[in-house]
């Protein structure tokens, strides 16, 4: 199943995806689309890159804020709405016959929590990484995005969850 990421309405969602350019600097085209990865290309493309830069974006809310030139093609969706919920496909179009890497990730957008006892930490958690993860084929990207907390592994998230629960914060 897809890795699941949760973001609150009005916040930024971060959907990780990366590859290792080989050799370094040898970039490959990538597309992000809404909907699971089809047979080739992406469905309902929201952003495309070529061998040099982003060359197609359907909205100004879609950004690659990581180090694109090092293979970090994680998607940031700014100011998310409930309509942004769904499965997204990150397709790394490695040259060759059927060589593509396909990564499906699920974004769940929720209405803001009514009670947030630890507002700063809660806000950062919402925008930086999922509050609920399931095991998937593609883990969090290694690079940080500006203004976000570092990516953490599942153990760290569960530890953080327990700490927040002890402090009275709500974790879904």
């Amino acid at each position: 199943s897809e890795v699941e990421y949760i973001a609150e309405v009005g916040q930024n969602a971060y959907l990780p995806c990366s590859y290792t350019p080989a050799p370094p600097g040898n970039l490959v085209p990538v597309c992000w689309g809404k909907g699971a990865c089809p047979v080739f290309d992406c469905s309902n493309v929201v952003l495309r890159t070529d061998n040099r830069d982003v060359n197609d974006r359907t909205s100004g809310r879609y950004w690659l804020k990581g180090d694109f030139h090092k293979g970090d093609v994680s998607l940031t969706i700014e100011n998310v709405t409930l309509a942004d919920s769904g499965v997204y496909c990150c397709r790394i179009q490695i040259p060759g016959i059927m060589n593509d890497e396909k990564h499906n990730v699920k974004l769940v957008v929720i209405k803001p929590a009514k009670v947030t006892p630890a507002p700063t930490l809660q806000r950062d958690l919402t925008s930086a990484f999922p509050r609920m993860l399931t095991t998937g084929e593609h883990g969090p990207a290694e690079t940080q995005t500006p203004g976000s907390l570092p990516d953490v592994n599942l153990t760290q998230i569960f530890t953080l969850t327990n700490e927040l629960r002890d402090s009275g914060a709500t974790i879904r």
Epitope: P29, G33, G35, A36, F40, D41, Q93, I97, M98, D100
Partner: antibody, heavy 120, light 107 residues
Framework: EVQLVESGGGLVQPGGSLRLSCAAS????????WSWVRRAPGKGLEWVSA????????YYADSVKGRFTISRDNSKNTLYLQMNSLRAEDTAVYYC?????????????WGQGTLVTVSS | EIVLTQSPATLSLSPGERATLSCRAS??????LAWYQQKPGQAPRLLIY???NRATGIPASFSGSGSGTDFTLTISRLEPEDFAVYYC?????????FGGGTKVEIK
Amino acid sequence: EVQLVESGGGLVQPGGSLRLSCAASGFTFRQNAWSWVRRAPGKGLEWVSAISGSGGSTYYADSVKGRFTISRDNSKNTLYLQMNSLRAEDTAVYYCAKGGDYGGNYFDYWGQGTLVTVSS
Amino acid sequence: EIVLTQSPATLSLSPGERATLSCRASQSVSSYLAWYQQKPGQAPRLLIYDASNRATGIPASFSGSGSGTDFTLTISRLEPEDFAVYYCQQYGSSPLTFGGGTKVEIK
């Protein structure tokens, strides 16, 4: 207006080769994935091959893998299909087809087709 | 590969009648299904994509529905120019496959 014009079809003997071309006009060629689809006499449609917008990634049906090669020249707005080791069962009308503007592997524009006949 | 079965193979109707065409997939394709119309000597024409979205320029009399394995193309009122062969196509799983077609003929 979108226009797709195929050429290069004809009669060829089994084991022979042909190169099909599809000249496109009326839109931005490079952004879309492209495919070749064929229709054999008295049969339905069969997807043959596809190529990504960049031209780097290619996809084939098992029936043609290793024999057919799809390519594109974005500077010429042209799609190609190099067909080698042709067999009688490759006899069909070959269509080039443009992938949807926002991705998706459906085809929103098709050429009129070019007939390939493989016979001795 | 995913097999698409279209039924009926032939549909005999009169102009003004409603046509209901079925396409069944051997396994789920989510909503990744398209419908095409083809007339003799012509290229296929996209009618519906993503199971229910009408393509540009397609009349409102054409509608698509379904998801998973069962899909339907409905022509609410047949016009003389609607008599043709209709194909469904899935793009949820490699390779892309088409159904065998349904011929809508004049009764």
